[in-house]
Amino acid sequence: ESLGTEQRVVGRAAEVPGPEPGQQEQLVFGSGDAVELSCPPPGGGPMGPTVWVKDGTGLVPSERVLVGPQRLQVLNASHEDSGAYSCRQRLTQRVLCHFSVRVTDAPSSGDDEDGEDEAEDTGVDTGAPYWTRPERMDKKLLAVPAANTVRFRCPAAGNPTPSISWLKNGREFRGEHRIGGIKLRHQQWSLVMESVVPSDRGNYTCVVENKFGSIRQTYTLDVLERSPHRPILQAGLPANQTAVLGSDVEFHCKVYSDAQPHIQWLKHVEVNGSKVGPDGTPYVTVLKSWISESVEADVRLRLANVSERDGGEYLCRATNFIGVAEKAFWLSVHGPRAAEEELVEADEAGSVYAGEQKLISEEDLGGEQKLISEEDLHHHHHH
């Protein structure tokens, strides 16, 4: 399903035609809107008796929920109306139309204030946790563009000082669950995620507790994308690694691109003692190079039996017709000198070139500094 099919309708009723059977239409409505779902009979024939279902349960008509054979209206929608809706034939239960509905607030960005809401002595002898800034917790839905930084905050107090933990979609959420990692700032009662991507969408719950009680708050994160968009990268942590001579090292990079990206692992190198070419751009060697047909690619560079010469800066780079994204990784190798130094295993190794975007291909043999285009992606003739 293309990313362009999602619609956002705020502040007015919107009628949406039903998708083909088997497809799921993803729809976003603003809080307070009238959600209107339309499911015309397939092929224009008679519809027969139908039933509308939300999250597996039949919808009961009310003053707010208006049910017809081909149309469902939910007036004054709220977050609780989000879910999976389907229109089914009453007798066979065959799904005629299927919709995924999200009811959101207007897009907003995270609270970016630092250094506030630190744990403070409230003077209370003992007590269960409570929110110290409940007015700052009204934004329960955060809709941010991809690649932005998101911060969720749950400023609280209690005696003894409560602990805070985080859940994603009801499960414990730790840094290793997300390729770019997370930052937990306990003093600020916050969770920070940098460079958000579509897989970060979900419900984030802070759980604040001490021996006298527990309170929790759930935020919903929606990551908004434009289609097409420049590749988005999440670099696996740690970005800087120190390895012992002879050990194995792996760098990890996640690439999101809705337009076939050309993905490369590169390493900065020296040529004749120089790190940059005559035009000032760095020399790099292509370690791996390929085109990804998927929207989401988990790419890894494995360096086996590392030697001192493997130390240095590595780049994960993704290019599509809109633009380029890249992340740098540093490797330091220490220990006794290896008897024999091994080269990196690579799909396509050995091309050294100067230039931020230079890939040596048939078109580039003239020596001009050229950009990667989709044509370059099709044939890699490295020299």
């Epitope: 097409p228 076939q260 633009g323 994204a325 078109e363 285009s373 989709e374 044509e375 099709h378």
Partner: antibody, heavy 115, light 108 residues
Framework: QVQLQESGPGLVKPSETLSLTCTVS????????WSWIRQLPGKELEWIGH???????RYNPSLQSRVTISIDTSKNQFSLKLSSVTAADTAVYYC?????????WGQGTLVTVSS | EIVLTQSPGTLSLSPGERATLSCRTS???????LAWYQQKPGQAPRLLIY???RRATGIPDRFSGSGSGTDFTLTISRLEPEDFVVYYC?????????FGQGTKLEIK
């Protein structure tokens, strides 16, 4: 929302150099590809070339000997120069975001080559 | 260079009908590097489809793209009055990136 605006003279004499500038607003010019495309009087579209924010370029081979695309990231602008123009270069010139396929376009500027 | 041929040159249909626009390339285009644009009079083209079948943001779902190799299709499932304009296909797999000559969609 990204917006692109072409600027430059609407009339150029034969054999002279056509110069246009595209100003990008709403986003940084960095890390993106930027193109020039023209639409000839018969309505056919022709890709002229593109530039990356680093300054690397690629041109249409049919125009390569006459075309130069440059970029000024400090001003969020990129430019087109087409030398030795003839009446056949009369067209609406568009600047756009993207290397090949493009998602944002300027509104276009008509350049007439005439003495 | 790769030549793109669009057919028909002009397509006459009524609102509510289904439109099928064809684009053939003189050489196979790998990885579906084909885009479709819509151009209204006096305006710049607007990207509808890229990657042969991906809809750009804000494009109604009545527009869909399909095809691979040398044969590509833009389908408009239910024509609206504002859809009666010119459509171009473009290949961006091989430089120079080239466009078709356009298909004009007119009201019958």
């Amino acid at each position: 929302q990204v917006q692109l605006q072409e600027s430059g003279p609407g009339l150029v004499k034969p054999s002279e150099t056509l110069s246009l500038t595209c100003t990008v607003s709403g986003d940084s010019i960095n890390s993106y590809f930027w193109s020039w495309i023209r639409q000839l009087p018969g309505k056919e579209l022709e890709w002229i070339g593109h530039i990356y924010s680093s300054g690397s370029t690629r041109y249409n081979p049919s125009l390569q000997s006459r075309v130069t695309i440059s970029i000024d990231t400090s001003k969020n602008q990129f430019s087109l120069k087409l030398s030795s123009v003839t009446a056949a270069d009369t067209a609406v010139y568009y600047c756009a975001r993207g290397a090949s396929a493009v998602d944002y376009w300027g509104q276009g500027t008509l350049v007439t080559v005439s003495s | 260079e790769i030549v793109l041929t669009q057919s028909p040159g002009t397509l006459s249909l009524s609102p509510g009908e289904r439109a099928t626009l064809s684009c053939r390339t003189s050489q196979s285009i790998s990885s579906g590097y084909l885009a479709w644009y819509q151009q209204k009079p006096g305006q710049a083209p607007r990207l509808l489809i890229y990657g042969a079948s991906r809809r750009a943001t804000g494009i109604p779902d009545r527009f869909s793209g399909s095809g691979s190799g040398t044969d590509f299709t833009l389908t408009i499932s239910r024509l609206e009055p504002e859809d009666f304009v010119v459509y171009y296909c473009q290949q961006y797999g091989s430089s120079p990136y080239t466009f078709g000559q356009g298909t004009k969609l007119e009201i019958k």
